[in-house]
């Protein structure tokens, strides 16, 4: 008789990474018996639910149900049904909820409430949903691409070509770009991490790691762009604002009273004679760049060195892989290629931010306008943040890694979150080598 | 303005195949979901299933399974509809329609249909 | 899968008149979506998420229900809203329309 695979001993896990300008559910399988393994977790499935982050329906609580019900119904078809009842879900929220709880504790629990509500309608075993804080966000994105890159292995790992090849078990840090939020995650060598709040120790694999992380709320790739516009119309002579950000021939009416929705404009907020204004882009890299610097407090530090507003940063040391935004950003304009220095990177922009908007329109007609037109500022925006930001140098930019996947699973925090919460990362190395799951009968 | 432009009124023999197309534009193609729905004259509506243009991910109502193959190219923002071994019951309208948020305003935008007329 | 019933199949009202048109589910559902089709033109969304009116619908339209049981009402029948309407439930795959109710103007 012919040998027949007994039917796999898997696990599942899904968890929810509800962002502050969309919401993405992602499913992870792993084989049962080598659970304590590293580098055995991947990624099956993403569903990017169809819509904004949950933070936006705040005045529309109920149909929170309706928005999640697409990428759900997703998991239970993808998941097979005798897995369901112990299939774990997580929902991990960050920046965008991070800020409205700033604003109101009340409606951000309310939010909450009724994503919970939700996900306990579904068949799985539900874990609860929660606002992450950017220290934990930082920390699991970093543990995710480790992961994945198989840092944390002393032996083979399971796959065989790694991307991003390096001989030693150095690790990576990790670089996170969201929309209201970015966090820097690094070993540093031999330094001391001044500020206790940024500093996390792990115990992974029978290894110690001391790790710096820092989350600056308010510095995503969206926030940012309206701190810029809160801070440049304060000194417009009129209602409209000559914008390098933009391109040449673009124009866009913005509502004063949604620039100053955000915890983020607060500090730049003052009574302006008009409640409208007029964005007209001027395309010009060089003073994009400078204006994106006055974002950036940095002649205040107590430490021995800081990125901005006064935030300790210890000097960068070895690679960096830069994901979710940083990479979705860059891979649009073109710019992942690891044998693009930043020179070549800064003049692309200065090449793109000053093509007309017409022409920008007609080379890219199936993006939404809304998206299209921020490439500019968002590429301006990566530069100035990791050069300026970060203290990234010509030399060092050659150390950073666009990375969107690793070996089929997104770069992001929610591999990292989920490993942890289901205790898959034991502090010592597991003692003997579980079987293999391809058994045969 | 979200627009949703399906292909023209088909007539095809028994037995043979046809690819229905549905080109998206005012929006990003990846953003939403299209859906495929069927309506034979007189009748209900039934859903055949979906596709997911960020992924390629696709969902099948068991009854159009083997029918019905829903492929995408994102380089034109259009969806395609292949039906295959056609049969004088496959003769009705097709829709295809996108429908989710646009910011927190719902929505559901719907082609305006494909006749499909099978004929010997 | 989800089976909906709606009745009644046809039915006639005055203008003025209060029309109501259910829908009934063979499983429990948390939320329906109406859609109006005139004929030879494309289903149109006119209520979403039970109770939700679609950009563009007159207040005289409102929905309800939850569960298994969900109904749409107009206030006052106008001539205009003559046409069929179907539920449709987005809960579990495969999502499924309703039989369609035909509502005309007497």
């Known amino acids: 008789t012919q040998n027949k695979a007994l039917p796999e001993n898997v696990k599942y896990g899904i968890v929810l990474d509800a962002g502050s300008s969309h919401t993405s559910l992602y499913i992870y399988k792993w084989p049962a018996e080598k659970e304590n393994d590293t580098g055995v977790v991947h990624q099956v499935e993403e569903c990017r639910v169809k819509g904004p982050g949950i933070s936006k329906f705040v005045q529309k609580v109920n149909e929170i149900g309706i928005y999640l019900t697409d990428c759900m119904e997703r998991a239970r078809e993808v998941i097979p049904r005798s897995q369901h009842q112990e299939t774990p879900v997580y929902l991990g929220a960050t920046a965008g909820m991070r800020l409205l709880r700033m604003e109101s504790e009340e409606l951000a629990d309310r939010v909450l409430d009724v994503v919970e509500r939700s996900l306990s309608n579904y068949p799985f075993d539900f874990q609860g949903a929660r606002i992450i804080t950017g220290q934990e966000e930082g920390a699991y994105g970093w543990i995710t691409i480790n992961y994945l890159l198989g840092k944390f292995s002393q032996k083979t790992r399971w796959f065989s070509i790694v991307p991003y090849e390096t001989n030693n078990q150095e690790t990576f840090g990790a670089l996170d770009l969201g929309g209201a939020s970015t966090q820097v995650t690094f070993v540093p060598q031999n330094q001391t991490i001044e500020s206790p709040d940024n500093a996390l120790q792990f115990r992974l694999y029978g290894k110690d790691y001391n790790v710096y992380t820092h989350s600056f709320l308010c510095y995503g790739k969206d926030q940012a762009l309206w701190q810029k516009l809160a801070k440049d119309i304060q000194v417009a002579s009129n209602e409209i604002l000559r914008d390098p950000c933009f391109h040449p021939g673009y124009k866009k009416v913005v509502n004063v009273s949604d620039l100053y929705k955000t915890p983020c404009t607060k500090r730049f907020e003052m009574t302006l004679p008009f409640q409208q204004f007029e964005i007209q882009g001027i395309g010009n890299y060089q003073q994009c760049h400078q204006s994106i610097l006055e974002l950036f407090n940095t002649s205040y530090c107590p430490y021995s060195q800081c990125a901005f507003n006064g935030i300790f940063l210890p000097p960068l040391q070895g690679d960096f892989g830069a994901f979710s935004a940083f990479y979705f950003v860059m891979k649009f304009l073109n710019l992942t290629s690891e044998k693009v220095s930043q020179e070549k990177v800064t003049e692309m922009m200065k090449k793109f931010c000053a093509q007309p908007w017409e022409e920008i329109k007609t080379s890219y007609a199936g993006v939404k306008e809304k998206y299209l037109s921020e490439y500019c500022f968002s590429g301006t925006y990566i530069l100035s943040l990791l050069l300026q930001g970060y203290h990234f140098t010509a030399d060092s930019w050659e150390h950073i890694h666009f990375i969107g996947k690793i070996q089929g699973s997104d770069a992001g925090w929610t591999l990292g979150y989920m490993l942890n919460l289901t205790n898959m990362i034991p502090a010592e190395q597991p003692l003997s080598t579980p079987l293999s799951h391809s058994t045969y009968v | 303005e979200i627009q949703v432009q399906q292909s023209g009124p088909e007539l095809v023999k028994p037995g043979a195949s046809v690819k229905v197309s549905c080109k998206a534009s005012?929006?990003?193609?990846?953003?939403?979901?299209m859906y495929w729905v069927k309506q034979s004259h007189g009748k209900s509506l039934e859903w055949i299933g979906f596709?997911?243009?960020?992924?390629?991910?696709?969902s099948y109502n068991q009854k159009f399974k083997g029918k019905a193959t829903l492929t995408i190219d994102k380089s034109s923002s259009t969806a395609f509809m292949h039906l295959n071994s056609l049969t004088s019951e496959d003769s009705a309208v097709y829709y295809c329609?996108?429908?989710?948020?646009?910011?927190?305003?719902?929505?559901?935008?719907w082609g305006q249909g494909t006749t499909l007329t099978v004929s010997s | 899968q989800i089976v909906l019933t709606q009745s009644p199949a046809i039915m006639s009202a005055s203008p003025g008149e209060k029309v109501t048109i259910t829908c009934s589910a063979t499983?429990?559902?948390?939320?329906m979506h109406w859609f109006r089709q005139k004929p030879g033109t494309s289903p149109k969304l006119w209520i979403y998420?039970?109770?939700n009116l679609a950009s563009g619908v007159p207040a005289r339209f409102s929905g309800s229900g939850s569960g298994t049981s969900y109904s749409l009402t107009i206030s006052r029948m106008a001539a205009e809203d003559a046409a069929t309407y179907y539920c449709?439930?987005?809960?579990?795959?495969?999502?499924?329309f309703g039989s369609g109710t035909k509502l005309e103007i007497t």
């Open positions: 329609a996108i429908y989710g948020y646009d910011d927190a305003y719902y929505f559901d935008y």
């Open positions: 005012g929006y990003s193609f990846t953003d939403y979901n």
């Open positions: 596709i997911d243009p960020y992924n390629g991910y696709t």
């Open positions: 499983s429990s559902v948390s939320y």
């Open positions: 998420s039970t109770s």
């Open positions: 449709q439930q987005r809960i579990t795959y495969p999502f499924t």
